[in-house]
């Protein structure tokens, strides 16, 4: 659907009005944003400024090494991940801008607000092939030492990016631009109409797929990874803990709010009020959910400068060092290179 | 009291335009819409477009190309414009308002104005 | 744009009696602020359309209260409990949630 020319105030002050007066004008414009748009706006400019830049340098500093360090391949695809989400901030910061007027077509519609759920997939399944990993260098060393390699973690990245992108077609096909007549607005949504039990479906699916079964299983998996590096004494395994304790809360504590609101709202009939309500804290839910995509970089920093003690080299040397290191960690009388024990535990929440 | 009162040709050659007023007393064209909606002969109503307060206008899409409405604030007209009539587009065109646009449909209707689109 | 089915085509009644009236968007009518735009029109012979309904069942003024309207998201219905001799002519439903506003092909009132 082509773009629609024309700019678009907010009359949204007149959305419950009830009695008519003739002096006062029925469709001019009120420019105030509501509260949970301005505290969007503010966390959207700050993913992307944090997001573009600290993913644009982990891609960086990890292309180089991606031929021959594992480690480098799962950190650059999180980070390609959370970089193609970010590029579409501006779009959707401007259409907030707009009182969420969407002047920017039907194919822009369908693809940059599927992106965030992209990312959402594409990252908690490459977290999942990197617990996998993790959890096979610690119980089955001999068999990485034989099978572990480059070419492997390539193509259990490419299913990792398929399966997201099959995830995601759902919310791309339902996705339409509604012109609503007055007050004059270009909408961007879903629009399931006649089906609620399609859109039932596809909200379980996406907190099933994306947050659930994620939780659950990545608990189990670390759960097990870190009992078994106390029980070795294995070498830094507080330092171990710690980050894959921040990069699991991530994910999850900030993809919370948008699946708490999506499941109720898809249970919940369009004109309740609890369904106004929750429609209004939307942009807020999807601006949170959205910090996983800026989230990565800080926590490689930060705990890059824990490992060194404090900041004494450059951010690329320091990223290098944590996102491609592929240390050695004792397991079953033989000696492999692991990632368990890495500070790059973040690959673990999105 | 609110009215729209329409006047205009009731018979236009092929390819040539049409043109009506709607005069509307009881509110004021600064501060409320009014849209134009159609009706041909035993056929359902067809909206052609509407004016808002601040000037805005926005077209059916079927008939964009086709269409024009202004207005006079001061002289509280409304004008809809239609070029290259054919015989199809013969009905009775109508001016109508909501007012209060946020709650209601088409509250308030002109009587109409019979257009016979014939050689 | 935004279909709107009407069922019956045509409705004959006796006087006194019920009359119920259905209509169906291609599309769900709930508009962002909440309200769903769904009018209910009635146009006798050589007149202009009346505002019978507005947003889905309220009354619009000087309209008695044997006309109701109810329904939700994309399924509407309008019913004359007692139906008299000056309720006879063409019922239209409307939507004006999306642009452009569409109205339904009408069900013709008519004495049985």
């Known amino acids: 659907m082509d773009s629609f020319n024309y700019t678009t105030p907010d009359y949204g002050h007149y959305d419950d009005k009830d009695t008519l007066d003739l002096n006062t004008p029925v469709d001019k414009t009120s420019n105030t944003l509501r509260v949970p748009d301005i505290l969007a706006l503010v966390i959207f400019a700050v993913v992307f400024l944090v997001g573009v830049l600290g993913n644009a340098l982990v891609v960086w500093v990890t292309a180089f090494e991606a031929k021959r360090t594992i480690n480098a391949i799962w950190f650059l695809n999180l980070a390609v991940a959370d970089f193609l989400s970010c590029l579409a901030l501006p779009i959707l910061f401007t259409s907030i801008v707009q009182h969420h007027h969407w002047p920017f077509g039907g194919a822009a519609c369908s693809i940059l607000p599927s992106l965030i759920l992209l990312n959402m997939y594409a990252s908690i399944l490459l977290l999942a092939t990197i617990s996998a990993d993790r959890f096979l260098l610690v119980f089955k060393p001999i068999w990485c030492q034989n099978f572990r390699g480059a070419g492997l973690a390539w193509i259990a990245c490419a299913v990792a990016w398929g399966l997201a992108l099959l995830l995601t077609i759902p919310s791309f096909l339902y996705r339409v631009v509604r012109e609503e007549y007055f007050p004059p607005k270009v909408l961007c949504g879903v629009d399931y109409s006649h089906d609620k039990r399609r859109e039932r479906a596809v909200a379980i699916v996406r907190l099933v797929l994306g947050f659930l079964w994620p939780l659950l299983t990545l608990t189990i998996c670390y759960t097990f990874i870190l009992l078994r590096t106390w029980s070795r004494r294995a070498t830094r395994s507080t330092k171990t803990l710690k980050v894959v304790v921040a990069v699991v809360a991530s994910f999850f504590i900030f993809w919370l709010p948008y699946q708490v609101t999506g499941i109720m709202m898809s249970f919940l009939e369009p004109s309740s009020p609890t369904f106004l309500l929750l429609k209004k804290l939307d942009s807020l839910c999807v601006s949170f959910a959205y910090i996983n995509c800026c989230i990565n970089p800080i926590i490689y920093v930060v705990a890059g400068q824990g490992f060194q003690g404090r900041l004494r080299k450059s951010l690329p040397s320091l990223l290098r060092n944590v996102l491609t290191e592929e240390s050695v960690v004792r397991e079953s009388k033989s000696f492999t290179r692991s990632t368990v024990d890495t500070m790059a535990q973040k690959t673990q929440a999105v | 009291q609110v009215q729209l009162k329409q006047s205009g040709p009731g018979l236009v050659a092929p390819s040539q335009s049409l043109s009506i007023t709607c005069t509307v007393s009881?509110?004021?064209?600064?501060?409320?819409?009014v849209d134009w909606v159609r009706q041909s002969p035993g056929k359902s109503l067809e909206w052609l477009g509407v004016?808002?307060?601040?000037?805005?206008?926005k077209y059916n899409s079927a008939l964009k190309s086709r269409l024009s409405i202004s207005k006079d604030n001061s002289k509280s007209q409304v004008f809809l414009k239609v070029n290259s009539l054919q015989t199809d587009d013969t009905a009775v065109y109508y001016c109508?308002?909501?007012?209060?646009?946020?709650?209601?449909?088409?509250?308030?209707w002109g009587q109409g104005t019979l257009v016979t689109v014939s050689a | 744009d935004v279909v709107m089915t009407q069922t019956p085509l045509s409705l004959p009644v006796s006087l006194g009696n019920q009359a119920s009236i259905s209509c169906r968007s291609s599309?769900?009518?709930?508009?962002?602020?909440?309200?769903?735009?769904l009018h209910w029109y009635l146009q006798k012979p050589g007149q202009s359309p009346r505002l019978l309904i507005y947003?889905?069942?309220n009354r619009f003024s000087g309209v008695p209260d044997r006309f109701s309207g109810s329904g939700s998201g994309t399924d509407f219905t309008l019913k004359i409990s007692r139906v008299e001799a000056e309720d006879l002519g063409v019922y239209f439903c409307a939507q004006s949630t999306l642009v452009p506003p569409t109205f339904g092909g009408g069900t013709k009132l008519e004495i049985k």
């Open positions: 947003k889905v069942f």
């Open positions: 599309q769900s009518l709930v508009h962002s602020n909440g309200n769903t735009y």
């Open positions: 004016i808002w307060g601040d000037g805005l206008t």
């Open positions: 109508a308002s909501a007012l209060d646009y946020s709650n209601y449909g088409f509250a308030y």
């Open positions: 009881g509110f004021s064209l600064t501060n409320c819409g």
